[in-house]
Amino acid sequence: QLPPGKPEIFKCRSPNKETFTCWWRPGTDGGLPTNYSLTYHREGETLMHECPDYITGGPNSCHFGKQYTSMWRTYIMMVNATNQMGSSFSDELYVDVTYIVQPDPPLELAVEVKQPEDRKPYLWIKWSPPTLIDLKTGWFTLLYEIRLKPEKAAEWEIHFAGQQTEFKILSLHPGQKYLVQVRCKPDHGYWSAWSPATFIQIPSDFTMNDEQKLISEEDLGGEQKLISEEDLHHHHHH
């Protein structure tokens, strides 16, 4: 029977700069029941506080609700592990909420085959930003990435959509079922998880005759890029 091993705070994330959660990994338990507590103070303060919510984020977590989250202050936190034989402390972690934002994935992903009479057919993809993020305040700029592939393909084709919430893709294999997903990231922060896959059957008469494929960030002022088939494979397959 031993004192507990050193815990480690390994991740802090905020969905929207208004709340955040940190998670720790326990060290060895020393063969005894072990209690964990997270304490923190804000930079420039000496008063220590205990984690306000150990429940919301699941096991080995601390959740900071709105009233405990300040954007303009750095949090200095550590985890204390205690059993009957003694205690151990994690290293201190410095957390600035601005830089730990990981949004929820975008919503309402819609995929449609468009076959205008006067133009080439294309796949039209659109989505909505995650609900927790208020883009109107200007606090956030979200960037988007789309990935798609034929159902049985192992490789995804990835397209960067910038700040657009719509995208057109012309180079597709007719007669295949495609999976499409989208994710987002703030200018400072982490990519969201990919959204659940949406799928669409590409009609067998979806034809591309030109060896050049037009990929457009929608005709809403988005810059159109003319990309050759060769460039497409080099730049968009990950």
Partner: antibody
Amino acid sequence: QVQLVQSGAEVQKPGASVKVSCKVSGYTLTALSIHWVRQAPGKGLEWMGNFDPGDGETIHAQKFQGRVTMTGDTSTDTAYMELSSLRSEDTAVYYCVGVTFDYWGQGTLVTVSS
Amino acid sequence: EIVMTQSPATLSVSPGERATLSCRASQSVASNLAWYQQKPGQAPRLLLYGASTRATGIPARFSGSGSGTEFTLTISSLQSEDFALYYCQHYNNWPLTFGGGTKVEIK
């Protein structure tokens, strides 16, 4: 023809863990993100989580936080779902499901009983 | 999480008649909705995805409509093999959730 074949029925005691396997054929696991869904006797369907073998990412329902682990072995095209700290309410048929929902495993009955 | 509500819980219909099943989402799921059929002792079977696209091998008597929060599954002329449980499920965002199911029984 795509097939998902699951491991056999299990009986476990409360507090134990169970690991259900799902062998993919007619497809490579790297191409197939896997959902796990369960159904308690006489009840409806409940989504547990998703495992993407391509990047190893997992997403799960909040109620399973800290109890469910989804993994995959691309060399054998097999996905796994492990549920720990079992309780009687976890007695259910567990299904693995292909990403487009049209391929389902046959189901694995897990019974939790002392 | 999005709550999916199916109605009615049980629908009694005579063979050859039309059956209309409803599914409501607590917030918009666009067209990211699937319908399943499940028979006793079997895994569910995908009927429709994208709210209205029939899955491979599904007969034309099954059709779906709706987008946003209100969805309908219609079976135009019920065959004996259609008496089963039906579930809707959204895949708009995480977590995915299912409706509670509608049992279609012989009248």
